[in-house]
Amino acid sequence: EPPTACREKQYLINSQCCSLCQPGQKLVSDCTEFTETECLPCGESEFLDTWNRETHCHQHKYCDPNLGLRVQQKGTSETDTICTCEEGWHCTSEACESCVLHRSCSPGFGVKQIATGVSDTICEPCPVGFFSNVSSAFEKCHPWTSCETKDLVVQQAGTNKTDVVCGPQDRLRHHHHHH
């Protein structure tokens, strides 16, 4: 009875186990009892990344600059081209088929993690003691100014969007306080 299974780098055809083609090559003709599988290298701008029996190689991905894409890694006969986004943009999906502008963190929010070619900016609300008064894709929350270290006093309390306002100490109150 003919075989029903083959080893991993083989495939079943016409009751025969034939060798698969190596990565970077496509199938031209199946093996016979007396001839080996015939394979041919993929052409320029084509690839196959596994042991295979494909009769056509896959086209390398095109990194379309109109979509904000650029080549991160050029494809070979065994690997696809890897696209990434232009500076200031990031991929919309894992496959990186298009790009969107990095998000900015609004006032009251700071950058927790700066965006990369594949991930967007991550913002966080400024906690008590910190503020951000700008919309930015880079700025973290800044700590409120410490008036005391400058020998000043808080004239206006800070918020998550504004720094504290420091002012000179009231000398009279300062004098009474010490006596």
């Epitope: 075989p3 299974a5 083959c6 080893r7 991993e8 186990c17 007396f34 080996e36 599988t37 394979c39």
Partner: antibody, heavy 127, light 107 residues
């Protein structure tokens, strides 16, 4: 050091069952296809069964089909052979053997061979 | 199933002799053939794969040739440690099969 070590052999009555184990070490077991091969006393080699690296594909010699089951646990680096409905003619030394795929520019289609063998475990089926 | 027939079944030779063992397949198997050496009480040892490629660490006095249905294993100059039993095996398709073996004995 690359090694295979069989265990679980012994004396069993006809119709009985036995489970052989093969412990692999020194290589990434889960990346290799494996086989069981047996040798009856004073006789030649007989291929018994095959299992793919994932365990998804198995095959058997006609003489054991329906009675023997090959399996593997890649997390424990173990290969098994469950032998049921044993017969006197199953008496043999059982070897586990690693399938290797050789591939280079001089051999673009590659070639298989069994490059690592255990020392074997004896199975005797007798009443 | 593919049958492999080895000849001779046994062979007596002397140290330094050139020895050839043949293996014939019942159907074409291209170059999907391996040769093994086995000594008493020991597991087989792979010598040749793909009909003609020498396994690493195997002395160059061993060579294999053939494709399709007819294969040969040649030992160019027998050494004392070469006296053993030799098996061919087809890995073309399942069930994988072995030849019946050739016992090489010292004269």
């Amino acid at each position: 050091e690359v090694q295979l070590l069989e265990s679980g052999g012994g004396l069993v009555r006809p119709g009985g069952s036995l489970r052989l184990s093969c412990a692999a070490s020194g290589f990434t077991f889960g990346s290799y296809e494996m086989n069981w091969v047996r040798q009856a006393p004073g006789k030649g080699l007989e291929w018994v069964s095959y299992i793919s690296s994932s365990g998804e594909t198995t095959d058997y010699a006609d003489s054991v089909k329906g009675r023997f089951t090959v399996s593997r646990d890649n997390s424990k680096n173990l290969l098994y052979l469950q032998m049921n409905s044993l017969r006197a003619e199953d008496t043999a030394v059982y070897y586990c053997a690693r399938d290797v795929f050789f591939f280079d520019s001089s051999r673009p289609n590659g070639a298989y061979g069994m490059d690592v063998w255990g020392q074997g475990t004896m199975v005797t089926v007798s009443s | 199933d593919i049958q492999l027939t080895q000849s001779p079944s046994s062979l007596t030779a002397s140290v330094g002799d050139r020895v050839t063992i043949t293996c014939r397949s019942s159907q074409g198997i291209r170059s999907s053939l391996a040769w093994y050496q086995q000594k008493p009480g020991k597991p087989p040892k792979l010598l040749i794969y793909g009909a003609s490629s020498l396994e690493g660490g195997v002395p160059s006095r061993f060579s294999g040739s053939g494709s399709g249905t007819d294969f040969t294993l040649t030992i160019s100059s027998l050494q004392p440690e070469d006296f053993a039993t030799y098996y061919c095996q087809q890995l073309n398709s399942f069930p994988s099969t072995f030849g019946q073996g050739t016992k090489l004995e010292i004269k």
